[in-house]
Interface confidence: low
């Protein structure tokens, strides 16, 4: 028998500093977890405990901190490779600042294979991306070889932007050919690492033959056995078996994700590449483990560009932006009205000639606006203006509802109005109109959306049986603020990009900007 | 090794603008700050800004944010710094250098440039 | 921004003896451990070379009579048993915040 150690991450997101226990910003460093440099401390830990070692990454390191927004993915190359991983797969996010933010910062600077057998390039962009990432790697480890196949979301054109020259195809498909070239290889040990979340991770157990292990991304999935040892609750044991349409015990695995956790795995294989066993459990990184004094001394340097990016001027507002709760808890705001304007704006994407947009709406919980920004500061913006505003470190994602869903959240949204609670709703593509009057739960009297499939876009009545697409904040996709309808109901989460950054893309985009109050949301007494 | 090669001297009138090239080699460009610093004769050293040129980030200092412009080439490793409205003040030795890396100098400048003898004069 | 001071401006000194250069921040430049001042050594018409990083850390290639001590606002430059191609000028260099920014020089003469 032959044992492999896997260790694993993804969805770190641009955690490169240690985090608080909920993944946002560090504030008592004796409580803080998660960071390269105690991961460094672990896997160096591991690396000279055991003999077969891989650190693998199953994606989306990019996206999600001030870090990201400032090195575009440098960072990410610069801390992998002092990391010395071994292998990554391609998740959606890497896409996001188009395909040559990802050649130039990460795939020309990686010193581990990215992999992705389900991207395929075509046109002008085949030669220059050609073997800047591969569909498989065969990786020598001790004595034996191990091929890493590698898959991404196949949502990708509709999470992120890479652009009209990347196919991407039905994993299943493109990953079964590779796994056979594998095989006739005589590579008999072969792990699928990806991105495209726990269901086709459990997919590719279940239908791709050959492979032995799955390492997984993009669901943030939590896995364990016993007790778990911080908040996040177990989907189901660690690791957890599917058993493939060909009699094999198949273990799939993922690591939740912003770095908190590394996945550590244990696989026995026979001398004809079978998994004999698998056992192991998620590190949780806290400060028990301590940080690596070198990386922590890299770090600290690359942050000092930070604090002096925060306080750039990024544009310019000619009105005041109004984000008190005493405006955004009770009425239509136009800070609230800029941010989800800003969340459609970074979900553009062409893909259909029938559609002028996959998704056109937005909601946005009041109580998450936390701070106005006054224009009578030569109107400047800077980062740290809207990390007033946006202090929370969330993400605004995109998920799929029925019309009765969204009807069920608006009436949550006004149900105990007048209370200066956070739950009232800021929107974009949406006019609602609310009658007061009427008891709580009935108070919705007008819901129009805009079109998305349509070449002039205009606002139709909400139809309570069709699936509609919306961008919010990961907060409300997990039902905060009360809003439990939506995690009950969603019918589709995919996580999107930091908050900050969204509409500091958007401010920067326009340079002057000067949101108005234009009748989105409206309340009418008696009949409509 | 690692070198930092820099272009020659300069002679500006008042008003004009200078650009300073700096081509580095001996090791990766774009995992590295490149910095510029000036030297006014008997005056101490002067930090202007730096650029990162991985990411084209860049950094200036107030006291020249208005005039000057860094930028970098990846394909040929070189970084620029561009002062314009150049006046008698200006008149220095400009250097680049590169900063520290891994686990070493946290943003000391290890290695430097011959540096370039910048003259605004009518 | 923070302004580093040197002194003494100048000094004299024969081969052999033992040098002391001080250099004051208006701030404190160190945390998690870590000092983020640096020396460095320049001779007429060159470019400046690095000596000490982080306060206390020998540059390699650097011989080892250089040292440095500190932390917070207060740093030394030492240099034991001095030797006639020492005679330069030496400076330090925070890298704290942005700006970074340099002490204004001590010329040391053998």
């Known amino acids: 028998a032959w044992e492999l150690t896997i260790l694993h991450t993804n969805d770190v997101h641009s955690r490169l500093e240690q985090t608080s226990e909920d993944s946002s910003k560090c504030v008592n460093a004796s409580r803080c977890m998660g960071g390269v440099a105690r991961l460094f401390t672990k896997v160096q830990q591991i690396r000279r405990a055991e003999p077969n070692v891989l650190l693998l990454d199953a994606g989306d390191q990019y996206q999600g901190t001030i870090w990201f927004t400032v090195y575009k993915g440098a960072e990410v190359a610069h801390f992998m490779n002092a990391l010395r991983y071994d292998a990554m797969a391609l998740g959606n996010h890497e896409f996001d600042n188009g395909v040559e933010g990802l050649i130039e910062p990460l795939l020309k600077e990686a010193k581990f294979p990215i992999l992705s057998a389900n991207i395929k390039a075509k046109g002008p962009l085949a030669s220059q991306i050609s073997g800047l990432y591969l569909p498989y790697k065969v990786l020598p480890v001790g004595d034996e070889v191990v091929g890493i196949v590698g898959y991404t979301s196949k949502e990708t054109p509709f999470l992120s932007n890479p652009g009209t020259n990347l196919v991407f195809e039905d994993e299943i498909t493109a990953l079964q050919p590779e796994v056979d070239k594998l095989k006739t290889l005589n590579v008999n040990k072969i792990i699928a690492l990806g991105h495209s979340g726990f269901e086709m991770d459990k997919l590719i157990a279940q239908k791709v033959r050959g492979v032995d292990v799955v390492v997984g991304g993009h669901s943030n999935t939590f896995l364990y056995t016993g007790n778990p040892p911080s908040k996040e609750v177990p989907a189901g044991k660690y690791p957890f078996i599917v058993t493939s349409d060909d009699g094999r015990k198949v273990p799939v695995v993922q690591a939740y994700a912003f770095g908190k956790y590394l996945g550590y795995l244990k696989i026995e294989f026979d001398e004809r590449g079978n998994v004999i066993s698998s056992h192991g459990n998620p590190i949780l990184l806290n400060s028990s483990i301590p940080e690596d004094p070198s990386i922590k001394a890299d770090i600290n340097k690359w942050r000092i560009k930070l604090d002096n990016y925060s306080t750039q001027e990024l544009g310019k507002t000619i009105v005041y932006l109004d984000g008190s709760s005493q405006s955004c808890r009770f009425r239509e705001c136009n800070m609230g009205n800029l941010i989800c304007d800003a969340m459609i704006n970074n979900n553009l994407r062409h893909t259909d000639e029938m559609f002028w947009n996959h998704v056109s709406m937005c909601i946005l919980n009041g109580g998450g606006i936390r701070s106005p920004i006054d224009e009578r500061n030569n109107g400047t913006i800077t980062w740290e203006n809207l990390a007033a505003v946006l202090p929370f470190g969330g993400t605004f994602d995109l998920v799929q509802l029925k019309g009765s869903t969204l009807k069920k959240a608006f009436e949550h949204s006004v149900h105990r109005y007048g209370q200066s609670t956070g739950e009232f709703l800021q929107v974009g593509g949406i006019h609602v109109v609310y009658d007061l009057s009427r008891k709580p739960g009935d108070r919705v009297v007008k819901l129009d959306v805009l079109c998305t499939k349509c070449r002039v876009p205009s606002y139709d009545p909400l139809k309570m049986d069709e699936v509609y697409k919306v961008i919010l904040p990961n907060f409300l996709a997990n039902g905060g603020d009360g809003f439990q309808m939506i995690k009950d109901e969603l019918l589709r989460h995919d996580s999107g990009d930091q908050d900050i950054n969204v509409v500091s893309t958007y401010i920067s985009k326009m340079k002057v900007i000067y949101p108005a109050v234009e009748g989105r949301i409206k309340f009418s007494t008696g009949s409509h | 090794q690692v070198q930092l090669v820099q272009s020659g001297a300069e002679v500006k009138k008042p008003g004009a603008s200078v650009k300073v090239s700096c081509k580095a080699s001996?090791?990766?460009?774009?995992?590295?700050?490149i910095t510029w610093v000036r030297q006014a004769r008997g005056q101490r050293l002067e930090w202007i800004g730096d650029?990162?040129?991985?990411?084209?980030?860049?950094n200036y200092n107030e006291k020249f944010k208005t005039r000057v412009t860094i930028t970098a080439d990846k394909s040929t490793s070189t970084a620029y710094m561009e002062l314009s409205s150049l006046r008698s003040e200006d008149t220095a030795v400009y250097y680049c250098?590169?900063?520290?890396?891994?686990?070493?100098?946290?943003?000391?400048?290890?290695?430097w440039g011959q540096g370039t003898l910048v003259t605004v004069s009518s | 921004e923070i302004v580093l001071t040197q002194s003494p401006d100048f000094q004299s000194v024969t081969p052999k003896e033992k040098v002391t250069i001080t250099c004051r921040a208006s701030k404190n430049v160190s945390t998690s451990g870590y000092s983020y001042m640096h020396w460095y050594q320049q001779k007429p018409g060159k470019a400046p070379k690095l000596l000490i990083y982080?306060?206390?850390n020998l540059e390699s290639g650097i011989p080892p009579r250089f040292s440095g001590s500190g932390y917070g606002t207060d740093f030394t430059l030492t240099i034991n048993n001095i030797e006639s191609e020492d005679a330069a000028y030496y400076f330090c260099?925070?890298?704290?915040?942005?700006?970074?920014?340099f002490g204004q020089g001590t010329k040391v003469e053998i």
């Open positions: 650029i990162y040129p991985g990411s084209g980030n860049t």
């Open positions: 250098a590169k900063e520290g890396g891994l686990t070493t100098e946290d943003y000391a400048l290890d290695y």
């Open positions: 260099q925070h890298s704290r915040e942005l700006p970074f920014t």
């Open positions: 982080l306060a206390s």
């Open positions: 001996g090791y990766t460009f774009t995992s590295y700050w």
